[in-house]
């Protein structure tokens, strides 16, 4: 008889050598072993080279083997599951080369203090990663970039003080995230991106509730049914959501989701959402506004959808956190060429501070489509994903200009033609916006005369009416340049042109801004009905260190053509300006506010 017991499971030979007082691999292991249990032995060190001849090996259990080192010097081409839990490993070697088929990796209950950046390189099939109960204090950026199929990630019971902002980027299959029992103080803005995570565990951290927590707070509010309290031995599916388990360490353990954020800028730059909770949901769309002076490139990736399930709004939101790259001296407006389209570079060299406003709306249902202009060739129906880039310079004083890039992609086999120049077409009066990018650029007064009214023009000489209202708000008692909020609204069912107005308002100091319309009080209104009206900079200069002048959107960047509508129909949009100060917690360069 063998030292180890032998059975078979789902066509795999299972060899159980657990707790046999082994100090090395047994000599009589069957050559066709598919599942090997070596747990609870005193192996000390282990090398994958010792198993290279076991070509059927699919599951390997090395838990509780007093391992202090692991060598991946032999390739186990079929290994899918590796259990290294409850050992004394202080570091992990690179695993991808030796274990290319790995789908589950359990290194929980070890002594890992850190992970090398490329430790998971090559693990493209990984679906479950268990790193709980280690001594991890930080995670390298890009750790999970190679593991795009990841479904379960357990980082609980470590010493993590912060998380890389892009940790979850690209993990579209992720469904369970364990982050409980760490030393986390906040969640980076945009951390969750557009992921819909059914099961998230976040309790027992050092959540510090201040204005930087607003993004996280809003995420908790939006995902309250997906946040759970972990209990030993209880299947998450048998428990009920408990968003109140996520508590502010600095505020008497008050739940983070109910943190009022008093004194924080409304629609703070640290939220990816708006704060207008009382506005009725319009599950068809998400609108993202970015208003920034940070001299970094902001790239937002979008996907155009023809349809989406009518679940929560979050599950329909399509956007990813920005990526930042260094910029060059020149800023260039670039339209990446696609078949039938032209490339239109326009170079600007200038020094003044540009405040860039980007309004991006993503279409969810299919009635409204993107179409090219008549002068452009229509792509084949099964167009490949194409890049449409609208670049906007936002230099600071004596710093390099910065482009702002928007990438639009379409799924393969899509029947929606996507022109390089985004044309907004609404087949019938509709309140559903189409994916588009409206770009407003402001700069200091220059010698070149600049119109004071913002217009969105069509390729032909024609007048397009502008969205109706711009409301600028700022909290009272501010002694520093405060992020200012503006709201663009369009009255519903209106069929007549509406003049554009700019309204400066200040919220009551004690009011939590949950519905801008009902809580702000008008202080000053300047109606911009003609170019001769009071220039907008006279209103804004009270709040900005540099004056602002509205520029028309470049014709080549975005053209909006309403059909059968007498005015441009846009959803309500909140936007916030930001000072260039690096010290303010509210001035993340890529805050964005989502509104229904």
């Amino acid at each position: 008889q063998h030292t180890c017991s032998i059975s078979k499971v789902t066509s795999l030979l299972e060899v159980n050598c657990e707790n046999k007082k082994l100090t090395a691999l047994p000599a009589d292991l069957p050559a066709d072993t598919g599942i090997l249990h070596l747990g609870e032995n005193q192996l000390g060190t282990f090398s994958t080279a010792s198993l290279v001849h076991f070509t059927h090996l699919t599951y390997l259990y090395l838990d509780r083997c007093e391992l202090t080192s692991l060598q991946t010097n032999g390739k186990l081409i079929k290994l899918e599951n590796l259990d290294l839990s409850h050992n004394n490993l202080k570091s992990l070697p690179s695993l991808g080369w030796a274990l290319p088929a790995l789908t589950t990796l359990d290194v929980s209950f070890n002594k890992l203090g850190s992970l090398s950046p490329g430790v998971l390189d090559g693990l493209s099939q990984l679906q479950e990663l268990y790193l709980q109960n280690n001594d991890l204090k930080s995670l390298p950026p890009g750790l999970l970039l190679p593991t795009t199929k990841l479904k379960k990630l357990n980082l609980a019971n470590n010493k993590l003080r912060e998380l890389p902002s892009g940790l979850l980027d690209g993990l579209e299959d992720l469904d369970t995230l364990y982050l409980q029992r760490n030393w986390l103080r906040t969640i980076p803005k945009g951390f969750f991106g557009t992921l819909l995570l059914p099961f998230v565990f976040l309790h027992a951290n050092s959540w510090y509730c201040d204005c930087e927590i607003l993004y996280f707070r809003h995420w908790l509010q939006e995902n309250a049914n997906n946040v759970y309290l972990w209990k030993q031995g209880v299947d998450v599916k048998d428990t009920t959501p408990n968003v109140a388990s996520v508590r502010c360490a600095n505020l008497d353990n008050a739940p983070v989701y109910s943190y009022p954020g008093k004194g924080c800028p409304t629609s703070s730059g640290d939220t990816d959402y708006d704060d207008y909770d009382d506005i009725p949901d319009v599950p068809a769309t998400r609108t993202e506004v970015k208003f920034s002076t940070n001299t970094k490139v902001h790239t937002t990736h979008w996907s155009l959808l023809a349809a989406a399930p009518s679940t929560s709004q979050d599950s329909q939101m399509i956007s990813l956190p920005p990526t930042h790259k260094p910029t060059k001296k020149q800023s260039t407006f670039i339209h990446t060429q696609s078949p039938g389209f032209t490339t239109l570079p326009e170079t600007m060299e200038s020094n003044p501070t540009f405040y860039s406003l980007k309004l991006n709306t993503v279409l969810i249902p299919s009635p409204t489509t993107l179409e090219p202009t008549s002068t452009q060739a229509t792509p084949e129906p099964n167009i490949q994903p194409m890049l449409t880039t609208s670049t906007l310079t936002t230099p600071e004083h004596s710093t390099t200009p910065v482009p702002t890039t928007t990438i639009l992609t379409t799924p393969e086999h899509s029947t929606i033609p996507v022109p390089t120049t985004a044309i907004l077409t609404t087949p019938k009066p509709s309140t559903i916006p189409v994916p588009t990018t409206a770009t407003l650029t402001t700069l200091e007064p220059s010698t070149t005369p600049v119109p004071t009214t913002a217009t969105l023009t069509t390729p032909e000489p024609s007048t397009t009416l502008v969205p109706t209202t711009a409301t600028l708000t700022t909290p009272e008692h501010s002694t520093t340049p405060v992020p200012t909020t503006a709201t663009l609204t369009t009255p519903e069912h209106s069929t007549t042109p509406v003049p554009t107005t700019a309204t400066l308002t200040t919220p009551e100091p004690s009011t939590t801004l949950t519905n801008l319309v009902s809580t702000i009080s008008p202080v000053l209104t300047t109606t911009l009905t003609t170019p001769e009206s009071t220039p907008i900079e006279t209103i804004l200069e009270q709040f900005f260190t540099t004056e602002l002048t509205l520029l028309p959107t470049l014709e080549s960047t975005t053209t909006i053509i309403p059909e059968q509508n007498s005015f441009l129909n846009l959803p309500e949009v909140a936007l916030v300006s930001s000072d260039t100060s690096e010290s303010s917690p509210f001035l993340n360069s890529d805050f964005c506010c989502f509104l229904p």
């Epitope: 032998i6 059975s7 078979k8 499971v9 789902t10 066509s11 069957p30 050559a31 066709d32």
Partner: antibody, heavy 118, light 113 residues
Framework: EVQLVESGGGLVQPGGSLRLSCAAS????????MSWVRQAPGKGLEWVSS???????YYPDSVLGRFTISRDNSKNTLYLQMNSLRAEDTAVYYC????????????WGQGTLVTVSS | DIVMTQSPLSLPVTPGEPASISCKSS????????????LAWYLQKPGQSPQLLIY???TRESGVPDRFSGSGSGTDFTLKISRVEAEDVGVYYC?????????FGQGTKVEIK
């Protein structure tokens, strides 16, 4: 045509031993897992043991330590050595071929009767 | 061990009529890795050895008439004979080939009324 022919059955006293053989033909014997399945008189089917193509044996608890399965690929023959036989081991013993690495049985022999009685 | 339970234990049938046999396992036979259910069906005709009818729940063995079909997932499985013929009489067994020890149902005896 696949053929499996069992032999070696008979009457044996409790505690005794018996060796069954299964001669295989019509397929590449060495490439397939083989098994023994038994059927007590008037009863259902019960798996007794298997051996992989690589020669790894495995058993249910009911016969573990008493029965030993083996194969001789050069002779295309499967064996079952039965020791410490009990009355409850009385059954028709079938030799069965598995399909690849799977563990269902696509061909069966005609069976050989083993009777354990005093 | 996985326990297999068949019902009914006896099934009188009329030729040309359909027949159905149920098999339940004490634990799931679904392999999440490949989404296959590891269940097989055998027919043991009177005085003969068992013969394989179906494996992986629904895959018919070559040479088996298409009036035999298998279905089910997880723990509940069914063998159906669309139109019973006289030659279909015998004892039908289900077997799980998910994990050893391989276990069989008690058998369902199909006989002509």
């Amino acid at each position: 045509e696949v053929q499996l022919v069992e032999s070696g059955g008979g009457l044996v006293q409790p505690g005794g031993s018996l060796r069954l053989s299964c001669a295989a033909s019509g397929f590449t014997f060495s490439s397939f897992a083989m098994s023994w399945v038994r059927q007590a008189p008037g009863k259902g089917l019960e798996w007794v043991s298997s051996i992989t193509s690589a020669g790894t044996p495995y058993y249910p608890d009911s016969v573990l330590g008493r029965f030993t399965i083996s194969r001789d690929n050069s002779k295309n023959t499967l064996y079952l050595q039965m020791n410490s036989l009990r009355a409850e081991d009385t059954a028709v013993y079938y030799c069965a071929k598995s399909r690849g690495y799977e563990d269902y049985f696509d061909y069966w022999g005609q069976g050989t009767l083993v009777t354990v009685s005093s | 061990d996985i326990v297999m339970t068949q019902s009914p234990l006896s099934l009188p049938v009329t030729p040309g009529e359909p027949a159905s046999i149920s098999c339940k396992s004490s634990q799931s036979l679904l392999n999440s890795r490949n989404q296959k259910n590891y269940l097989a069906w055998y027919l043991q005709k009177p005085g003969q050895s068992p013969q394989l009818l179906i494996y992986f729940t629904s895959t018919r063995e070559s040479g088996v008439p298409d009036r035999f079909s298998g279905s089910g997932s997880g723990t509940d499985f069914t063998l159906k004979i669309s139109r019973v013929e006289a030659e279909d009489v015998g004892v039908y067994y289900c077997q799980q080939h998910y994990s050893s020890p391989w276990t069989f149902g008690q058998g369902t005896k199909v006989e002509i009324k």
